[in-house]
Each structure stands twice: as C-alpha cells, then as structure tokens.
Interface confidence: low
C-alpha cells in the first residue's frame, strides 16, 4: 500500500476524553467525550466508544487511563488489562492491537492504602475505512475519571 | 480552522531534555535543555520551561519523567502528579492538558528500599500561536535527572 | 537542517512486534517480527533487532515492553532498565536515546505474588540515513511476550 500525505488535505486526528459516562459497567468498551473541552474529531468519526476511520492509512493510536483505589477490593482481579482493540467488518471478533497488563493493587501494602497508577499505550497500526478502534479496561472499576485530562484516547495519521 | 501540511514547510517539532537545572524548587514548571545533546527546537520556541507555539495547529505533545527514591521521605505526598499544562493569553490560569497520578513510593515496603518508576504522557491538543505548554511534577523532589534520556518533553504538529 | 515533507513521498513508518524469538539471552538487543500480524516496515528497514533509517530526518520513536513475574527471582536486579539506543557509523558505542528505569518487583510483597508492569517510551530524535535504533531491556528475563500486542517497537517521521 502506498499512502501519501496530500498537501491540500487535512490530516485525520482525534483526541477523546474521559467523562462521567465513560464507564458503562456493561462489559462494553469505554465511552468518550468527543466535543467538549479538549476533545475533538478531525477526519475521523465516533460511534459508541469507537473511533471510526474514514480514510485508510497508518495511524498512531494512543490511550491513557488513570487507575486508582483504596487497597484492593475483594473480587478484584490482581491484574488490570488496558487495551486498544480493532473492530473490522471482515472479522467477527475484536482484534487486540496494543495491550498492557499491570498490577497496581500490589503497591498498597495495607487494605486502607490509597494508590494511583497510570497506563499509557501508543503505536502505529494500519486501519481501513470503516474499521473501528475501541478502548477496554478490565477491571474498569479501577478507572478514575475527573476532567478529561487523566483518561483519554486519540489517533492521528502518520 | 483548516490546518494544512504544506509540502514546502518544515513541520514544527521539538524535543527538550532534562538537565541539572531542570528542578528549580521554586514551585514553577520544570526547565529544559534546548540545544545540547538530543535536544532541539524546529518551528517552536522556548521560554522559561515552556514550549512556545509559533504556528497554530494540532500537536502531539509528550513528556516522560524518571522518578526514584529510597523509601518515602517524611513529608512526601504519597501521590505524584505529572502533567502537561497550557498557558494561554485568553485565560489567566494554566489549563490542565494531560495529567497522570502515581503512587510509586508504595512499592517500597521498607524505608531503605530503592525504587524507580517512570511516567509517560502523550496526546494531541490544539495550540494557538503564542500559547505555551509546560511540564509540572509535584513533588519534583522525586524526579531523577541524569543525562537527558530519562526525563524529557517534546511536541510535533500532526 | 531543513526537513521537508514532500507531498508525493511516502512518510517513513514502522511497527515491529514481540515474538518468541525476541529474547535472545545473549546480551544483545531485542529482536522483532517485521511482517506478520500487525508488524510492517514502510520506508525503513530492519537488521538484527534494529530499525535502520533510509531517509534522514526527525522521527518519533517508541517502544513498549510488558514485564511480569512471580515474586522476584534470586539474582534479579531490583531495577529494570528499558531503553531505545542509537547505533551510528560515526561512533563506536551505542548512544542512549530514551530510557526508563522501573522497580516492578517491589510491588510483590510475597515471593509467590504474580505481578505485571508495562514500560512505554516515546520521543522525537534526529536520525541520519544508515543509523540504527534498537531496544534493550535489562533484565530481559522479565519481558513477557505473547502475541505481539504487549511488547513492540516503532517509529515514524514527523
């Protein structure tokens, strides 16, 4: 594939931010703010938590999530998985793109200890028009939202 | 706003590195090396710790800081905040852009245990000409500088 | 240096993924998958673990490694170093570009505790044609490979 950056075209880019509605508890991907504050879409669209590609090419995709808690709640997995996943019409299941596993609870030596951790992912992937990228965190109960600066999701064509 | 990448224009980019003078202890932002070693400025300028935008557009901005210590010094907050902040003529206060909170001290179970941690932030934001971006770390006493490779700050237009 | 992005040229980019052969145990850099799955090379080449630059310019280079273990093996350094290094024909030794140090073992308070951590590095550096960039992790015994999504290495011209 030859991908050229035309000088007269706007380069697709987006930055979506965490909001109170991001965590659904439904087992689905995180949802994002697309318009308010620092959030924007330029040459990409959004649907139900997903960045939707309108122009095929190589994209640097990234996400950060802010994790935090007090000790480790009972029943909470000791491993937190934060990942970027692709949904494509050509394949029935989500495909892992970039994934991190962390054990932040292990930092808290007493059950009442407050802890914070952050997970950042970024990398270049090829995306076709119509393909979607989503962010998932398992267990999402540890994601700490505030003002859109601590948990976010974005992409730009390279 | 339509932002075009003109084929004859240099794309703004910068990478600033940590130096002995980075930590001022004054409550201000971190200061950076702009010329020596790996540091450079291309189409961006620098003033008192800030990357200064000369051309409006969307920028991927990033920073990494190396944290480290021996146990947790008394009086040291258990939470470290590392953030990228915008200063704009249109608003009197700094605006949070990208922020992380971490509790690295919690890893050291004894007071004499040496620990290291790293915090990385990156994301796309829109910046107008004249706006400035700075890096802050609270508590900056935990930032470990060496040779410019472990703590740094940069940006490029996307 | 004036670096122009010509509208008719393909912008160099690459994303290399971790594979079973990545960890050599030889003290050398990590090796990477260049073709299968998510891996690709576009305007860059690869040799013995290194991304090789064919066109001089400023590149955003990045790497993530997935770390994990059960407690801390005897003889294992308490500090893990993850770095991107440059090899240049003009200098006999590797040059540190971007480096992180972490103490993930410190999270595990008992010797049988499973822990996970992730290290991400990214930043803009200038690279000449013929120069090479490699990833090193010390101690690489803690790098956990799976399917190319958890440990990776990439770059693109900015």
């Amino acid at each position: 594939l030859i991908q050229e950056r035309r000088s007269h075209e706007v380069n697709p880019a987006a930055h979506l931010t965490g909001a109170n509605s991001s965590l659904t508890g439904s087992g689905g991907p995180l949802l994002w703010e697309t318009q308010l504050g620092l959030a924007f879409l330029r040459g990409l669209s959004y649907h139900d938590g997903a960045l939707v590609v309108t122009k095929a090419g190589y994209y640097y995709i990234y996400s950060k999530v802010q994790l935090g808690g007090v000790g480790c709640p009972l029943g909470l997995a000791s491993t937190i998985t934060h990942g970027l996943y692709k949904r494509t019409p050509r394949y029935p299941e989500e495909l892992e793109l970039l994934v991190s596993q962390q054990s932040p609870c292990g930092r808290a030596t007493s059950s009442s200890r407050v802890w914070w951790d952050s997970s950042f992912l970024g990398g270049v992937v090829h995306l076709e028009a119509g393909e979607k990228v989503v962010v998932r965190v398992l267990d999402e109960r540890l994601v700490r939202l505030r003002d859109g600066t601590r948990s976010y999701f974005g992409a730009f064509m390279v | 706003l339509i932002q075009e990448r003109r084929s004859h224009e240099v794309n703004p980019a910068a990478h600033l590195t940590g130096a002995n003078s980075s930590l001022t202890g004054s409550g201000g932002p971190l200061l950076w090396e702009t010329q020596l070693g790996l540091a450079f400025l291309r189409g961006l300028s620098y003033h008192d710790g800030a990357l200064v935008v000369t051309k409006a557009g969307y920028y991927y901005i990033y920073s990494k800081v190396q944290l480290g210590g021996v146990g947790c010094p008394l009086g040291l907050a258990s939470t470290i905040t590392h953030g990228l902040y915008k200063r704009t003529p249109r608003y009197p206060e700094e605006l949070e852009l990208l922020v992380s909170q971490q509790s690295p001290c919690g890893r050291a179970t004894s007071s004499s245990r040496v620990w290291w941690d790293s915090s990385f932030l990156g994301g796309v934001v829109h910046l107008e000409a004249g706006e400035k971006v700075v890096v802050r770390v609270l508590d900056e006493r935990l930032v470990r500088l060496r040779d410019g490779t472990r703590s740094y700050f940069g940006a490029f237009m996307v | 240096l004036i670096q122009e992005r010509r509208s008719h040229e393909v912008n160099p980019a690459a994303h290399l993924t971790g594979a079973n052969s990545s960890l050599t145990g030889s003290g050398g850099p990590l090796l990477w998958e260049t073709q299968l799955g998510l891996a690709f090379l576009r305007g860059l080449s690869y040799h013995d673990g290194a991304l090789v630059v064919t066109k001089a310019g400023y590149y955003y280079i990045y790497s993530k490694v997935q770390l994990g273990g059960v407690g801390c093996p005897l003889g294992l350094a308490s500090t893990i170093t993850h770095g991107l290094y440059k090899r240049t024909p003009r200098y006999p030794e590797e040059l540190e570009l971007l480096v992180s140090q972490q103490s993930p073992c410190g999270r595990a308070t008992s010797s049988s505790r499973v822990w996970w951590d992730s290290s991400f590095l990214g930043g803009v550096v200038h690279l000449e044609a013929g120069e090479k960039v490699v990833v090193r992790v010390l101690d690489e015994r803690l790098v956990r490979l799976r399917d190319g999504t958890r440990s990776y290495f990439g770059a693109f011209m900015v």
Partner: antibody, heavy 122, light 107 residues
Framework: QVQLQQSGPELVKPGASVKISCKAS????????IHWVKQRPGQGLEWIGW????????KYNEKFKGKATLTADTSSSTAYMQLSSLTSEDSTVYFC???????????????WGQGTSVTVSS | DIVMTQSHKFMSTSVGDRVSITCKAS??????VAWYQQKPGQSPKLLIY???TRHTGVPDRFTGSGSGPDFTLTISNVQSEDLADYFC?????????FGSGTKLEIK
C-alpha cells in the same frame, strides 16, 4: 466572506412538519459546527442543537429531542433543521449559526444567518 | 442547566456615556462566556468571546470582563448605533444557554 443564507418564511399547519435550510459560503463547511437557535418574539435565545457536517455528528438540547432533526448536505454546503408535530409554541424565528471547532476548547458562535420565521396556523 | 441571569431588562444611557451590562452564571463557567449584540430586525452578532476577547471587527469601546459566575460587558463612549439587545451566553457545558437579554436605550 462568511455567509449563512437561510430559507424564507414558512406558514404551516398545526401537526405538520417543516424543513428549513441554511446555506454556508465563504469558509470550509465541514470544519465548523452549525448550531440552531430559537428566538421567540421579545424573548431570549434558546439553543436547539448542533451538527458537525464533517461527520454528521449531532448534539441536541434535551428539550428539543424529538422536535428538531438536524442534517447536512456537504455537496451543497447546506444544513437543514426539520421541525415536526408543529404547534403554536413553535411559531417564531430560527437562526442557524456557526462555531469554530479548530481550537482545543469549544468556542462562541461567530456568524449567524438572517433567521427564518415559522408561523404555525390553521 | 446553567442559568445565565441578566438582572437588568432595560438600561438607559446617553451618547458618550459609559455603561456596564452584567450577567451572572448559576454555576462556575470559567471564562467560557460570549456576548452578542442584536439590533432590531437583525440577527445577533458576536462581540466578545472567552469573556474578554473582542471578535474581529468589533470596536474597542466594547470590553468584556469577569470569570467564574460574574461577567460584565462595558461599552465606553456609547454611540447611537449601539441601541440594541445584548445577550450573554455560556459555552462551558451543555445545553448551551443564553441570558434573557438587556435592551440598551439611548436617551
């Protein structure tokens, strides 16, 4: 120069629908939000919602969900607002206006159409 | 919803005078406030955004100030063509809301 040219006055019957248009010129239509604002005589301004023509994403004031439907045709640089199930409460002037999305934080409405008067009468 | 209160429905002034029109937000909106002028039979025109930044082409006799809940539009050296309704608007959160307007009358 930037212009938003709205369609002419409408006289419609109660219960019917009406679709009013807003043709943009002098700027890149797909790079700005188009908002719609209602102004009843002698009263203030009420925000109805916006559409971003670049991706057909819409945002509505909860109060107008089900009442207003916003669409856009990028080929003609025209935004539309359809009002359904009309009652006398809908008799008023409607403005389209644009908002620059090019800054990192949202902005104000910098250019406005001349307004379209809708009269609901049997 | 954030309520923008313009307590004066009418204000009377003379040519050459200075007048201040106020607007109070029911919640903190930072400086995400705009001011619009609407002359009789016309559509609104943007005067001020980000509480204090003049829009292109707006005469410098129009000045915006304030942050948090309290905002002021000041017109110094009032001219006869300034006869109009003035509306404040917050764009800090949805739904976007406007003040009820202040009608400036020239004596």
């Amino acid at each position: 120069q930037v212009q938003l040219q709205q369609s002419g006055p409408e006289l419609v019957k109660p219960g019917a629908s009406v679709k009013i248009s807003c043709k943009a010129s002098g700027y890149s239509f797909t790079s700005y939000y188009i908002h719609w604002v209602k102004q009843r005589p002698g009263q203030g301004l009420e925000w109805i919602g916006w559409i971003f023509p670049g991706s057909d994403i819409t945002k509505y004031n909860e109060k107008f969900k089900g009442k207003a439907t916003l669409t856009a045709d990028t080929s003609s640089s025209t935004a539309y607002m359809q009002l359904s199930s009309l009652t006398s409460e809908d008799s008023t002037v409607y403005f389209c206006t644009r908002e620059d999305y090019g800054i990192s934080t949202y902005s104000a409405m910098d250019f406005w159409g001349q307004g379209t008067s809708v009269t609901v009468s049997s | 919803d954030i309520v923008m209160t313009q307590s004066h429905k009418f204000m009377s002034t003379s040519v050459g005078d200075r007048v201040s029109i106020t607007c109070k937000a029911s919640q903190d909106v930072g400086t995400a406030v705009a001011w619009y002028q609407q002359k009789p039979g016309q559509s609104p025109k943007l005067l001020i955004y980000w509480a204090s930044t003049r829009h292109t082409g707006v005469p410098d006799r129009f000045t915006g100030s304030g942050s948090g809940p309290d905002f002021t539009l000041t017109i110094s050296n009032v001219q006869s063509e300034d006869l109009a309704d003035y509306f404040c608007q917050q764009y800090s959160s949805y739904p976007l809301t406007f003040g009820s307007g202040t009608k400036l009358e020239i004596k």
